[in-house]
């Protein structure tokens, strides 16, 4: 659910929400990093509807979520990929 | 590189089910956050999207047409597919196949295009 | 569904000229600071090519000539000095809403 995301498109966050999204309305959450033809670290979450919200990455929520799922990921072995 | 390549017969008779498909190459159909589409163009009029399936078979149809359209995907054949039933004069037309640009989702663009197939419904 | 009228519907110009094509919707397609609006160039039996999205950026390939602009509904693509290779015809879409929906053309022909 959590992906780094690399893109040619310049920046895609204009505006960016602090609004809480429910975790079961999330998809995916992409990041983009800070350079990336963008000069800051975006937060892109794709949510089951297929709509895309731009979320400020100091929002407390997202933070939340994103922890968690990197304390997940860190205890899970990895996958192999064919 | 990206292509795409649409085919399917070029004349269908009326009251009858147009199907295209669609080959792909150069990108997955399973992606996240990958769609495909068609979108039409009657002879000397304006484009005209019809439908679109998202990596994970959502479906899009066009309101207008939605009630005779079915889009629908082979992944393991990088290839999608659509039909069109209970045809008429008025859809005779280029069929073009498109993939979207995968950036926002339900509003996105087209930003690789098949090169048309001509459909024309007669008998 | 938001409608897209395009104006002109065709226009004559020469080598050298610039040119502006106008696109309305009938209701905006900006959200959350983006508008949703695309253009697309098409040549006799071809298919379109993607020229500029979200309103003002430009595809990678499409020649500096090429600018757009606008917000909520009302969009202008320029050519700044026409090419010969520009003679074609321009299409409008709005992806903010289902239907995504195209304006009628814009056919640019040779004065």
């Known amino acids: 659910v959590l992906e780094v995301y690399y893109t040619h498109l310049r920046c895609r966050c204009v505006q960016e929400s602090s609004v809480f999204i429910p975790r079961r309305f999330i998809d995916r959450i992409q990041i983009s990093p800070r350079g990336n033809g963008c000069p800051r670290k975006e937060i892109i979450v794709w949510k089951k509807n297929k709509s895309v919200v731009c979320v400020d990455p100091q929002a407390e929520w997202i933070q939340r979520i994103m922890e968690m799922l990197r304390k997940k990921s860190s205890s899970t072995p990895p996958v192999p990929v064919f | 590189q990206v292509q795409l390549q649409e085919s399917g017969p070029g004349l269908v008779k009326p009251s009858e089910t147009l199907s295209l498909t669609c080959t792909v190459s150069?990108?997955?159909?399973?992606?996240?956050?990958?769609?495909v589409g068609w979108i039409r163009q009657p002879p000397g009029k304006g484009l005209e999207w019809i439908a679109h399936i998202w990596w994970d078979d959502d479906r899009r149809y066009n309101p207008a047409l939605k009630s005779r359209v079915t889009i629908s995907k082979d992944t393991s054949k990088n290839q999608f597919s659509l039909k069109l039933s209970s045809v008429t004069a008025a859809d005779t037309a280029v069929y073009y196949c498109a993939r979207i640009a995968g950036y926002y989702g339900s509003r996105d663009w087209f930003a690789y295009w098949g090169q048309g197939t001509t459909v024309t419904v007669s008998s | 569904d938001i409608q897209m009228t395009q104006s002109p519907s065709s226009l004559s110009a020469s080598v050298g000229d610039r040119v502006t094509i106008t696109c309305r919707a009938s209701e905006s397609v900006d959200n959350s600071g983006i508008s949703f609006m695309h253009w697309y160039q098409q040549k006799p039996g071809k298919a379109p090519k993607l020229l500029i999205f979200r309103a003002s950026d430009l595809e990678s390939g499409v020649p500096s000539g090429f600018s757009g602009s606008g917000s909520r509904t009302d969009f202008t693509l320029t050519i700044s000095s026409l090419q010969p290779e520009d003679f074609a015809t321009y299409y409008c879409q709005q992806s903010n809403k289902d239907p995504w929906t195209f304006g009628q053309g814009t056919k640019l022909e040779i004065k």
């Open positions: 150069g990108f997955s159909l399973s992606t996240f956050g990958m769609g």
